[in-house]
């Protein structure tokens, strides 16, 4: 009788676990595990997790609250969502603004920072994709302006500005020389 | 073989302290929940202080609460027990006994040491 | 607390009869989870430490002769002694195991005739 014995609970249901002398019941989410039961198979204290504290499983055995994150003003994340006894804060960007992770396997809880969205707008282009998880996607030049080089350039007002082949099929006219 | 080994016992004055000692051997003791249980000098026999294995949980009946501490040293398989503020009614013979970890029966127990409490 | 009564405090019996001895608790000792009744039964002999005789009730210790028998479920509790030996003179002492604060019966005292 003196070797190593693995703690048993013989109780029915899942959710029970060693805790103490006794197999105890685990906490509801949101709550942290104040006393465990004094008796087999029998529900813990379990207290609501204190402000800025969290517990997201249920049937947990956790004898204190995670504390909740705080959205890195450094970065430009902001909260999305504010943490509660169940949940952690959800941070994230604000509108117009994107998600830059700063490691390249990006996960939901890798670091990242914001970046403000590109302005398609700004320059003259159509907006292809809206900036969300990356930076907006810029299509074509806007109606009245035409490629050149990396950026859309306004058609000439006047027949005295220079209109090269891509500016005439845009713009609709060819400077006579 | 399980041994189970008591010390510390002594006579004390009201109001004073002590405290028991109870080496263990023979067993993987970190793995086991202990108790002290004493036996009053007309044969009642009395839970007094419980301790678990692993992150230790501790419990007491009212009649003691606030006065006894149980501890354990795992490196010294040692069980303990503070008794502080002792009255006339604390005399009795100690003993450590071991849990069975399933059902909290004690398997096993030591030999016991005596305490008197007099002025 | 659970309350635990035992009875007789004392009895004396010639060797080889059948003894009883009862123990009754405030409130059920039976786990609805696993059926189990956190009841032992403790032997106490002159000038030694208590020893496990039974668990959950029923259940005897390795090492104890199968003349100690126990049973019961619930509130109510037995201790029987088949045919009683000059050894078995002692102090039987049940213990709720049950619930903190663990409690004891006052005992009964076994002489021999």
């Known amino acids: 009788q003196g070797g190593t014995r693995s703690p048993r609970c013989d109780c029915a249901g899942d959710f029970h676990k060693k805790i103490g002398l006794f197999c105890c019941r685990g906490c509801p989410a949101g709550h942290y595990l104040k006393a465990p039961c004094t008796e087999p198979c029998g529900n813990s204290t379990c207290l609501v997790c204190p402000q800025d504290t969290f517990l997201a499983w249920e049937n947990h055995h956790n004898s204190e609250c995670a504390r909740c994150q705080a959205c890195d003003e450094q970065a430009s994340q902001v909260a999305l969502e504010n943490c509660s006894a169940v949940a952690d804060t959800r941070c994230g960007c604000k509108p117009g603004w994107f998600v830059e992770c700063q490691v390249s396997q990006c996960v939901s809880s890798s670091p990242f920072y914001c970046q403000p969205c590109l302005d398609c707008g700004a320059l003259h282009r159509h907006t292809r994709l809206l900036c969300s998880r990356r930076d907006t996607d810029c299509g074509t030049c806007l109606p009245g302006f035409y490629e050149h080089g990396d950026g859309c350039v306004s058609c000439p007002t006047s027949t005295l500005g220079s209109c090269p082949e891509r500016c005439a099929a845009v713009c609709g006219w060819r400077q006579m020389f | 073989e399980v041994q189970l080994v008591e010390s510390g016992g002594d006579f004390v004055k009201p109001g004073g302290s002590l405290k028991l000692s109870c080496a263990a051997s023979?067993?993987?003791?970190?793995?086991?929940?202990m108790s002290w249980v004493r036996q009053t000098p007309d044969k009642r026999l009395e839970w007094v202080a419980a301790?678990?294995?692993?992150?230790?949980?501790?419990y007491y009946p009212d009649t003691v609460k606030g006065r006894f501490t149980i501890s354990r040293d795992n490196a010294k398989n040692t069980l303990y027990l503070h008794m502080s503020s002792l009255k006339s009614e604390d005399t009795a013979m100690y003993y450590c006994?071991?849990?069975?970890?399933?059902?909290?029966?004690?398997?096993?127990w030591g030999q016991g040491t005596t305490l008197t409490v007099s002025s | 607390d659970i309350v635990m009564t035992q009875s007789p405090s004392s009895l004396a019996m010639s060797l080889g009869q059948r003894v009883t001895m009862n123990c009754k608790s405030s409130q059920s000792l039976l786990n609805s989870h696993n059926q189990k009744n956190y009841l032992a039964w403790y032997q106490q002999k002159p000038g030694q430490s208590p020893k496990l005789l039974v668990y959950f009730a029923s259940s005897r210790e390795s090492g104890v002769p199968d003349r100690f028998i126990g049973s019961g479920s619930g509130t109510d509790f037995t201790l029987t002694i088949s045919s009683v030996q000059a050894e078995d003179l002692a102090d039987y002492f049940c213990?709720?195991?049950?619930?903190?604060?663990?409690?004891f019966g006052s005992g009964t005292k076994l002489e021999i005739k």
């Open positions: 301790i678990s294995s692993g992150v230790t949980y501790t």
């Open positions: 006994g071991r849990h069975d970890d399933y059902g909290n029966h004690f398997d096993y």
């Open positions: 213990q709720q195991h049950y619930s903190t604060p663990f409690t």
């Open positions: 023979g067993f993987t003791f970190n793995n086991y929940g």
